[in-house]
Structures are given as C-alpha cells and as structure tokens.
C-alpha cells in the first residue's frame, strides 16, 4: 500500500512539476525590468526566451518574437535546449510512469517489468528536473552579470548633459515558477525510484524470512522487541503476500514449506 | 466611433472644489488609460495624470497631486476629476483625452472651461 | 521632469514650401525594450482640442496626410510638412509619452505669408 501511495503520489508530484516546466518555458516573464532606483518610466519592458514584449501605460502590450536563431546570444540558446530537453525527458517519463503505476493493471505484466518501468521514469524525472533548474539558473546568472554590467554603464556614461534612461532586467515569474517545477519534477522523480525498490521481488529476502520462520526459538526475545534476521534491518524486511502488507511476525504465524520438512 | 463626452463650463469661487466629467463610448471602456490635460488661455498643454479604468490605478503630474483626484465609474464608462482648493490659477479648459498607441492621446474631450474669479 | 525644447517659434512658410520644426528632449525618449521612440506630435487649431498627428516619433497616425513626417531618435527629432497648405495654420506640440510625468514642448506656432 505504501509503494503504490509512494508511486502515487511520485507520479502526480512530477506530473505537476512538468505542467511548470512547460508554463515556464512558455512564459514571457523571464526577465522583466528592474523598476527600483530608475526613473518612472510609462513603459514595462519584460523578455521570455522566445519573445520580448512592452506594455505601455496606454493599455497596449506589444509583443515581439525572436526570429532568428543565429543572432541570438548562446546562453539564450543553451536554455532554451535544456528547457525543451526536460519537457521531453519529463513526457517520455510521464508516459512510462502511466504505465508502471501498480494501481493499473496492463495485461499480465510482472511486478519486475513494472519496478523497471517506475526505475525509467524516476531517472527522466530527476534528469527532467535537473535540466529544468539548470536553465533557469543559466539564465538568472546571465540576468545577474548583465544587471552589473549595465549597473557600471549607469555611472559612468553620465558624463554629457543628455542622459539615457538604462533599461535594467531582474529575475522573472517565469524563473520561480522554473525553479519551483524544477524541483518538484526532481522530487517526484525520487519518490519513484524509491517506490520501484518496494516493487521489486527482493528474492534474498523472501528466503531469509521463511528461512527463519522455524526457528521459533529467535522469533522472540525477552522484553517482547523484535529480532533481527541479519538480512539488514526490519523495515527492509517487510514484504507483500497475498495483496497485504505483513511484517516479519506475521508471516511467522502463518505455515511455511519448510515447517513441514 | 470613439466618442468623449465633457461637462459642461463651471464657475467657481475661490477655495471651492469642482468635479469634471468625461463620458468615453464607442470602444471597451477597461482597455485604454484615461488621461486629463489642462490648457490655460493662449498657453501650452500640462499634463494632469492619468487613469487605469480597469483597476482604479492613477497616476499624476506631482504638480497636481493634492490639486486633482482621477476617479472612474466602469459602470457608467465616466472618468471624473475633482479639483480641490480652487484659485484663479486654475482658471483653464481641461481635456480628458483617451490613450492609444505610444502613450499618445488620440482621442479628446471637446474640453471643459472652468473660470474661477480673482 | 524631462524638458521639451521646441523650435522655431513662430515658424512662417509660404503655402507650398517645405516647413520643419525642432524639438529636444532633456533625456533619451528611445526604449531599449522595443527600440521605439516615444515621442508624439499634436496640432492644435484655434479653439479645438489637439490632434494626433504622429506617435512613436515617425509613425503616421491613419487619417493624417502623408504630407506629415516625423523623424529623430533618442533626444533630437524633428517634424516635416512637405508641402505646407491654408489648412495647416496651428501650433504643433511634441510630446514626452516615456517617462512621467508626460510633458509637452511650449509649440511652434506655423504661420503662412
């Protein structure tokens, strides 16, 4: 039940993640400009990572794409590919992961086929997420030398009488909204692959449980603690029969093949 | 076609306070900011401040803050200006005049003449 | 406040002649953001309020004959009557529309001989 609520809830987590990373890529508010410690200006000037737009006092927002490719700024470019590259890796995963959810059944498909399902998907989310983070903290770096730079260019091209209004850009929506996705894409992807080890058959385990259900002997210890069966610790130990999560002492009550011998 | 409708010429005396209408028809009256324009006799134009009539929001000439209050009623598309403490250096024809493209104003009032004596 | 210096005033032509009037701005009116100019020019005829001839410094406004052009970027610009008619007698205005408060020049007032 706690694997399939820990896949559960993996798989959500990621699929929500990935709806903010596609929002985010999409958005035009990567960087909007910096309006503290600047004239007040009538116009709002805010950039995404396909198109910048203005919106005027008047009303009127206009909005411009970037259509060229080789005259844009490699960093601009980079981001985008690892944006684009984390909703890829984010779809293919969500697709895998529909799949390797234990509360649907596909046929007569094996837990293991399922466990390695949930593994795949897990290893997209976290790479997804990663990829995610990594643009938006490329482009918030790019934000941040560039408002220096142009910081600099403030004071020292004052020197005639005509001044020029410097158009300074800060951190976007789109930037938390990346790094907020981003890591629950990547959180979501841990979750799964935490669920895939407890729907693996741990073959060793089995064995070591029923191995030591005749021994009635270390079933118990004086002060009514549980004994550890040296297969790691207890947790590790529990395992699914019938549909239901037993413990170690539970599955002792019930007869096993060896009793018999 | 877009259509801004002034009130009426006022007479005021001095430290009496006036309130200006302007009645916008013919386009969405929430998409564009409303502004206000004051021109005294044979002299330029001064800018008062302007109104966001979507949210309420304003914004004004610090030469008019105090002077003039920008109100607007979406209900009735009527943009409203209050000039307080009346002088004669208030005596003036004012516009309120729509925005368009660049922050221009291409539409105006036919401008409200407010006289106040000496 | 940004401060509009408008030139020549008065500005007398002969009807059919060429004008053009000045006028400079304290600071830069060009935004980065969209590389547009804000800059707008009015006509105001006598006891009529202005007119929208030009806005974002040379972008006609539709109804306005071609006769009227605007030009300059960042703090010097400039307006051009081709061919100056009877009906053109009025005081054009420049207008800052990018940084508040909005402020106009004094006008030029275009005189015919």
């Known amino acids: 039940m706690a694997v399939t609520a820990c896949q559960g809830l993996g798989f959500v987590v990621s699929l929500i993640g990935i709806a903010g990373i596609i929002a985010a890529t999409c958005m035009d508010q990567w960087s909007t400009q910096d309006l503290y410690n600047n004239p007040v200006t009538a116009v709002f000037n805010y950039q995404g990572l396909w198109r910048s737009c203005v919106r005027e006092s008047s009303g009127f927002t206009e909005c411009r794409g970037y259509f060229t490719l080789l005259g844009l700024p490699a960093m601009l470019q980079a981001v985008r590919a690892l944006m684009i590259v984390g909703i890829v890796l984010g779809a293919i995963g969500l697709l895998v992961s529909i799949f390797a959810l234990k509360c649907i059944r596909i046929g007569s498909m094996e837990d293991s086929a399922k466990a390695n399902m949930t593994l795949t998907s897990g290893i997209m989310f976290i790479v997804s997420g990663l990829c995610a983070i990594a643009g938006v903290s490329v482009f918030a770096n790019m934000l941040v030398t560039n408002f220096w730079m142009s910081t600099a260019n403030m004071y020292t091209g004052m020197g005639g009488m005509v001044q020029t209004v410097q158009t300074r850009y800060t951190f976007g929506a789109a930037l938390f909204v990346g790094w907020v996705a981003g890591g629950l894409t990547l959180i979501g992807g841990v979750m799964m692959c935490i669920a895939c080890r407890g729907l693996a058959p741990e073959e060793t385990n089995y064995k070591a449980v029923s191995y030591h259900a005749s021994g009635h002997s270390v079933a118990y210890k004086p002060g009514g603690f549980k004994a550890s069966t040296g297969f790691g610790s207890n947790t590790k130990n529990k395992k699914i029969y019938d549909g239901g999560a037993r413990t170690e002492d539970e599955v002792q009550s019930y007869p096993s093949k060896h009793d018999y011998v | 076609q877009v259509q801004l409708q002034q009130s009426g010429a006022e007479l005021a005396r001095p430290g009496a306070s006036v309130k200006l209408s302007c009645k916008a028809s013919g386009y969405t009256f929430t998409v564009w900011s409303m502004s206000w324009v004051k021109q005294r006799t044979g002299q330029g134009l001064q800018w008062i401040g302007e109104?966001?009539?979507?949210?309420?929001?304003?914004h004004y000439n610090e030469k008019f803050k105090g002077k003039a209050t920008l109100t607007a009623d979406k209900s009735s598309s009527t943009v409203y200006m209050q000039l307080s403490s009346l002088t004669s250096e208030d005596s003036a024809v004012y516009f309120c005049?729509?925005?368009?493209?660049?922050?221009?104003?291409?539409?105006w009032g036919q401008g409200t003449l407010v006289t106040v004596p000496a | 406040d940004i401060v509009m210096t408008q030139s020549p005033s008065p500005l007398t032509v002969t009807a059919g002649e060429k004008a053009t009037m000045s006028c400079k701005s304290s600071?830069?009116?060009?935004?980065?953001?969209?590389?547009?100019?804000?800059l707008t020019w009015y006509q105001q005829k006598p006891g009529q309020p202005p007119k929208l001839l030009i806005y974002w410094a040379s972008t006609r406004e539709s109804g306005v004959p071609d006769r009227f052009t605007g030009s300059g970027s960042g703090t010097d610009f400039s307006l051009t009557i081709s061919s100056v008619q009877a009906e053109d007698l009025a005081v054009y205005y420049c207008?800052?529309?990018?940084?508040?408060?909005?402020?106009f020049g004094s006008g030029t007032k275009l005189e015919i001989k």
């Open positions: 207008q800052n529309d990018f940084i508040y408060p909005f402020t």
């Open positions: 109104i966001y009539p979507k949210s309420g929001n304003t």
């Open positions: 005049a729509r925005a368009y493209y660049g922050n221009s104003f291409a539409y």
């Open positions: 600071q830069s009116l060009l935004n980065s953001g969209n590389q547009r100019n804000y």
